[in-house]
């Protein structure tokens, strides 16, 4: 069972937010994998990097991701006083000065080279959900998370109007 | 103003029921999990039940001492959430507290005021 | 169950003296690299008042005084310099696991 906070009915602007702290509150080095345990792997091509989600063979060493978690005052229209808190956002990368990207034109990941400051387009909040799992909004357009399509990351419209559960937004990290 | 405000409290007898009501306003209530927490007169806080989202077919979660008595259910339309609760004890006797969990699912930061329950022959 | 154990019971520090509250779980609250570890604040009469969560983020609103650390089984919640308003119960929080449990309070008073 798992749960979706960002819904398409959900109108505040992420983009809005401010991230509290240039530094991230902590870091963690772990493999990211699908609801059903498909890795999401990063492999050089043509001098760019693509993401792939796969079944990995037996004794297949699992690409790392170094995730920095920041936190971030989720703006409120619905009332002024700060009431929703504080959320937690993420930057996902599985090579040094390379993030993770939301490409809303294309409705697409990649895997782009960048300095700091980070683009808005590098940051997700992370959803905490049940089944040890998580899944990533962007930052950039609240309702769209970073899904598995075609055995690619892709973004994925999450409606909450439709009574049927999704699992291909859902992420498994693990140390191993 | 983000508001939960519950009602459905009284006195019960053992072996009766309740049903609890949790009215929700100042937010997109659909958008959020739902929780109730009791606290025994004088004691601490206990969690008691979750429910999810129409997205996830309302996927609800409960502490293991009211598993199988009480329900917990939302109705989005009325931006109401429910504890309904049967077979009641005297070790329920409580307020009982309406919670919202915070966007992205951390944790509870908007809480209602309580109704208390008194299971009492 | 993940079982929270807080101590001491209760408190009394002198206005402007630093407070300290612990709170172990019975196994490991992380996930995810993070610690799955919240702390509220319950004033007679009300419902509870997020502190931290995770372990050491500060919620909305809530003065600097107030503090969090720690990993792993023990964690611990820190008032820098207590003030008059301090005076309540102290709670911690696993949400690593359903159920969520907590510990069982820290009551803080003014010496």
């Known amino acids: 069972a798992f749960g979706i906070s960002g819904v398409q009915k959900y109108t505040r602007a992420l983009h809005d937010s401010s991230i509290t702290g240039i530094s991230p509150i902590t870091e963690y080095l772990a493999s990211l994998s699908t609801y059903n345990d498909q890795s999401i792997t990063f492999a050089l091509e043509d001098e760019s990097y693509e993401i792939y989600v796969e079944d990995l063979k037996k004794d297949e060493k699992k690409d790392k991701v170094l995730l920095s978690y920041y936190e971030s005052q989720h703006p409120s229209n619905e009332s002024g006083d700060g009431v929703d808190g504080k959320m937690l956002m993420v930057t996902l990368s599985p090579t040094k000065d390379f993030w993770l990207h939301a490409n809303n034109k294309e409705h697409s990941v990649e895997l782009h080279k960048c300095e700091k400051p980070l683009p808005d387009q590098a940051f997700f909040v992370l959803h905490n959900m049940h089944s040890n799992c998580v899944s990533f909004e962007c930052k950039t357009d609240p309702g769209v998370f970073i899904g598995v399509k075609d055995n690619h990351l892709a973004l994925i419209k999450v409606d909450s109007s439709e009574n049927l559960c999704t699992e291909n937004i859902l992420f498994k990290l693990s140390e191993t | 103003e983000v508001q939960l405000v519950e009602s459905g409290g009284g006195l019960v007898q053992p072996g009766g029921s309740l049903r609890l009501s949790c009215a929700a306003s100042g937010f997109t209530f659909s958008n959020y999990w739902m929780n109730w927490v009791r606290q025994a007169p004088g004691k601490g806080l206990e969690w008691m039940a979750e429910?999810?989202?129409?997205?996830?077919?309302?996927?609800?979660h409960y502490a293991e001492s009211v598993k199988g008595r009480f329900t917990i259910s939302r109705d989005d339309s009325k931006n109401t959430v429910y504890l309904q609760m049967n077979s009641l004890r005297a070790e329920d006797t409580a307020v009982y507290y309406c919670?919202?969990?915070?966007?992205?699912?951390?944790?509870?930061?908007?809480w209602g005021q309580g109704t208390l329950v008194t299971v009492s022959s | 169950d993940i079982v929270m154990t807080q101590s001491p019971d209760s408190l009394a520090v002198s206005l402007g003296e630093r407070a300290t509250i612990n709170c172990r779980a019975s196994?490991?609250?992380?996930?995810?690299?993070?610690?799955?570890l919240n702390w509220y604040q319950q004033k007679p009469g009300q419902p509870p008042k997020l502190l931290i969560f995770?372990?050491?983020s500060q919620g909305s609103g809530v003065p600097d005084r107030f503090s969090g650390s720690g990993s792993g089984t023990d964690f611990t919640l820190t008032i820098s310099s207590l003030q008059a308003e301090d005076v309540a119960v102290y709670y911690c929080?696993?949400?690593?696991?359903?159920?969520?449990?907590f510990g069982q309070g820290t009551k803080v008073e003014i010496k």
């Open positions: 196994e490991s609250v992380d996930k995810f690299g993070m610690s799955f």
């Open positions: 995770v372990a050491s």
């Open positions: 919670a919202r969990r915070n966007y992205g699912n951390w944790y509870i930061n908007v």
């Open positions: 929080q696993q949400s690593k696991d359903i159920p969520y449990t």
């Open positions: 429910i999810t989202l129409k997205f996830n077919a309302y996927s609800t």
